[in-house]
């Protein structure tokens, strides 16, 4: 391991469409990939009238957008589906939204997902 880098070996797994996809609904996912490539965790969610609905969480393949991010934060302004990625085991347990476009002080409540 490179000093200062959080290697990702496992991520929180969640799938809202677990029945359709024939997967578990929630659990811990071991992350696989080419040995020399980095691995990350991700979270996707929707904001339906202020209510957070988690879509999926799991492992994400080598992506420079995720490098050295210990926190899972979506920065895109008002996406249809929110997405964030991070490095470090289970780093996708919590996720936040801090839009970069915002001129005024952004507000965000970190979300600790509670599967239904």
């Amino acid at each position: 391991a490179i000093l200062g880098r959080s290697e990702t070996q496992e991520c929180l797994f969640f799938n809202a469409n677990w029945e359709r996809d024939r997967t578990n609904q929630t659990g811990v996912e071991p992350c696989y990939g080419d040995k020399d490539k980095r691995r990350h965790c991700f979270a996707t969610w929707k904001n339906i009238s202020g209510s957070i609905e988690i879509v999926k969480q799991g492992c994400w393949l080598d992506d420079i957008n995720c490098y050295d991010r210990t926190d899972c934060i979506e920065k895109k302004d008002s996406p249809e589906v929110y997405f964030c990625c991070c490095e470090g085991n289970m780093c996708n347990e919590k996720f936040s939204y801090f839009p970069e476009m915002e001129v005024t002080q952004p507000t965000s409540n970190p979300v600790t997902p509670k599967p239904p």
């Epitope: 999926k56 799991g58 994400w60 393949l61 992506d63 420079i64 957008n65 895109k76 589906v81």
Partner: antibody, heavy 115, light 111 residues
Framework: QVQLVQSGAEVKKPGASVKVSCKAS????????INWVRQAPGQGLEWMGT????????SYAQKFQGRVTMTRDESISTAYMELSRLRSDDTAVYYC????????WGQGTLVTVSS | QSALTQPASVSGSPGQSITISCTGT?????????VNWYQQHPGKAPKLMIY???KRESGVSNRFSGSKSGNTASLTISGLQAEDEADYYC???????????FGGGTKLTVL
């Protein structure tokens, strides 16, 4: 092993649309991006755009904005690229590739636009 | 984002070393370690050889190496072999906030 299998060759008339599919296997489809690249006969590679396979978020090359639509169906691990208002200079082999590094490629789909 | 600049062709004899350059700007090649190199044989799909400037893709011969200086990335092939004859493209990472771009390609001829 990772595989990306694309749909077969298409012949289209100018002004029509074409939709190319890319079925992924051997990895978790929703764990990366799918990029689309085309190559006109005897020419180089041209990046068209990318889709995040889990969120559906897309980014398109400026040249194709308004004419290309990238979608995916997670339930069948398949990505799609639709190009509309086809012209003769859209004749090319269209490739899908996995991830931001393009580490695995489909076999290519030849789209011929001819009147 | 404008295309990256590569020489149209290079050549070398078996056993020699050759280098292919890929020049961008300070805002793409110069700023990030996200340049990749692809090999394409006629009628085949491209194959990733080097990613992130200098990381060799799994299964790729150690005769292939990548480096970067300023706004120029380079692919070096040592101990040239007949099967290395192909087109080589440089390109950038694409996904999220990063937009992709390729070089025009370089035809490598093994004499």
């Amino acid at each position: 092993q990772v595989q990306l299998v694309q749909s077969g060759a298409e012949v289209k008339k100018p002004g029509a649309s074409v939709k190319v599919s890319c079925k992924a296997s051997g990895y978790t489809f929703t764990s990366s991006y799918i990029n689309w690249v085309r190559q006109a006969p005897g020419q180089g590679l041209e990046w068209m755009g990318t889709i995040n396979a889990v969120s559906g978020s897309t980014s398109y090359a400026q040249k194709f904005q308004g004419r290309v639509t990238m979608t995916r169906d997670e339930s069948i691990s398949t990505a799609y690229m639709e190009l509309s208002r086809l012209r003769s200079d859209d004749t090319a082999v269209y490739y899908c590739a996995r991830g931001g590094w393009f580490d695995y490629w489909g076999q290519g789909t030849l789209v011929t636009v001819s009147s | 984002q404008s295309a990256l600049t590569q020489p149209a062709s290079v050549s070398g004899s078996p056993g020699q070393s050759i280098t292919i350059s890929c020049t961008g700007t300070s805002s793409d090649v110069g700023s990030y370690n996200y340049v990749n190199w692809y090999q394409q044989h006629p009628g085949k799909a491209p194959k990733l050889m080097i990613y992130g400037v200098s990381k060799r893709e799994s299964g790729v011969s150690n005769r292939f190496s990548g480096s970067k200086s300023g706004n120029t990335a380079s692919l070096t092939i040592s101990g040239l072999q007949a099967e290395d004859e192909a087109d080589y493209y440089c390109g950038t990472f694409a996904g999220g906030k990063y937009y992709g771009v390729f070089g025009g390609g370089t035809k490598l001829t093994v004499l």
